[in-house]
């Protein structure tokens, strides 16, 4: 169900049309459900889940992580270079989003709805930013030279990418929701 | 099972300061999401909640408190320390620690430890 | 900061009755509100997360509802161990605020 057309919303004809902040909050619970079942098949369908931490640091992938200096800790908190961080991290995430396109057999609209939603989560926050110019975007070349390489992957290797970038996104994404909850 | 306990001082001088330590076990405070926080309840009233850290250590601290507290992790030995500043009579409470662990971050505390009144 | 409101602060029922209490946001939570019952001498316990959720083991005779700034805690067919105060808590931003509470004898 899209983000807006839950029965709660249903059962309460009276309630406010959502405002730009209960949007966002929203869509971020909505692609956090996605990656929970996303991250459902893959720990039955490999024991990835279960490895541990130092094996997972090892991988080299440059997945975006929240750092104190982003402006989205309460220390240091700023709104719009956190606001941009955001942004820009989705916009990062999009080309890994894309590579789990063919990574599910069960949940494959699952991925794509993780996907899609993603897009419209950064429409949304573009909207609420003042400072757009700050927002790099990925350069589309390297993105495709780097969606080449992790297909080429072998199997296990495979695996462990989108375990771990289900699991950083997950992360990226909570975040997010944290910070701009307090917007 | 996730269990926390709460351990300090059960009588502080005015002035002193004051240091709560709160052992978990059953969940690891380096997952996504996680949290615990600190609640405190003086004898009959209602509950303050005082402090929080993440998964990541993004800290908050009451406003009201803030100037006082330090809230602390060490992941490997799976505590989570509170100090209080310059305690006074009116700090005397059952202090909690919590934990908070969702996906969606309500914030909501799911496991609590007993309590340690702090006279 | 976001105040909580509670109302009543304290009411009586008998076994078997239902019985409702209110919580106010001083400002839109959306849903992010937190319901806990606390015994005498004993730590609080989660009882509804996220306005309407039940927490895993709770009763379903307890319903929590509402969204933005208004929210009950309905509890049908009262048991003797029901008895003692019941807290909300909003969870939307940091700092986080409890409510003075409900105290419920049965």
């Known amino acids: 169900v899209p983000p807006g057309e839950d029965s709660k919303d249903v059962a309460a004809p009276h309630r406010q049309p959502l405002t730009s902040s209960e949007r966002i909050d929203k869509q971020i619970r909505y692609i956090l459900d996605g990656i929970s079942a996303l991250r459902k098949e893959t720990c039955n369908k490999s024991n990835m889940c279960e490895s541990s931490k130092e094996a997972l640091a090892e991988n080299n992938l440059n997945l975006p992580k929240m750092a104190e200096k982003d402006g989205c800790f309460q220390s240091g908190f700023n709104e719009e270079t956190c606001l941009v961080k955001i942004i820009t991290g989705l916009l990062e995430f999009e080309v890994y989003l894309e590579y789990l396109q063919n990574r599910f057999e069960s949940s494959e609209e699952q991925a794509r709805a993780v996907q899609m939603s993603t897009k419209v989560l950064i429409q949304f926050l573009q909207k609420k930013a003042k400072n757009l110019d700050a927002i790099t975007t990925p350069d589309p070349t390297t993105n495709a030279s780097l969606l080449t390489k992790l297909q080429a992957q072998n199997q296990w290797l495979q695996d462990m990418t989108t375990h771990l970038i289900l699991r950083s996104f997950k992360e990226f994404l909570q975040s997010s929701l944290r910070a701009l909850r307090q917007m | 099972q996730v269990t926390l306990k709460e351990s300090g001082p059960t009588l502080v001088k005015p002035t002193q300061t004051l240091t709560l330590t709160c052992s978990f076990s059953?969940?690891?405070?380096?997952?996504?999401?996680?949290?615990v926080g600190w609640v405190r309840q003086p004898p009959g009233k209602a509950l303050e909640w005082l402090a929080f850290?993440?998964?990541?250590?993004?800290?908050y601290y009451s406003p009201s408190l803030e100037s006082r507290l330090t809230i602390t992790k060490d992941t490997s030995k799976n505590q989570v320390v509170l100090t209080m500043t310059n305690m006074d009579p009116v700090d005397t409470a059952t202090y909690y620690c919590?934990?908070?662990?969702?996906?969606?971050?309500?914030?909501?505390?799911?496991?609590w430890g007993q309590g340690t009144l702090v006279t | 900061d976001i105040q909580m409101t509670q109302s009543p602060s304290s009411l009586s029922a008998f076994v078997g009755d239902g019985v409702t209490m209110t919580c106010w946001a001083s400002?839109?939570?959306?849903?992010?509100l937190n319901w806990y019952h606390q015994r005498p001498g004993e730590a609080p316990e989660l009882l509804v997360f996220?306005?309407?959720n039940l927490q895993i083991g709770v009763p379903s005779r307890f319903r929590g509802s509402g969204s933005e700034t208004y929210f009950t805690l309905t509890i049908n067919s009262l048991q003797p161990e029901d008895s003692g105060t019941y807290f909300c808590?909003?969870?939307?931003?940091?700092?986080?605020?409890f409510g003075g509470g409900t105290k419920l004898e049965i």
């Open positions: 850290i993440w998964w990541d250590d993004d800290k």
């Open positions: 400002q839109s939570i959306n849903d992010y």
């Open positions: 919590a934990r908070s662990a969702d996906d969606y971050l309500y914030y909501s505390f799911d496991t």
């Open positions: 996220a306005a309407s």
């Open positions: 808590q909003s969870g939307h931003s940091f700092p986080l605020t």
């Open positions: 059953g969940f690891s405070l380096s997952t996504s999401g996680v949290g």
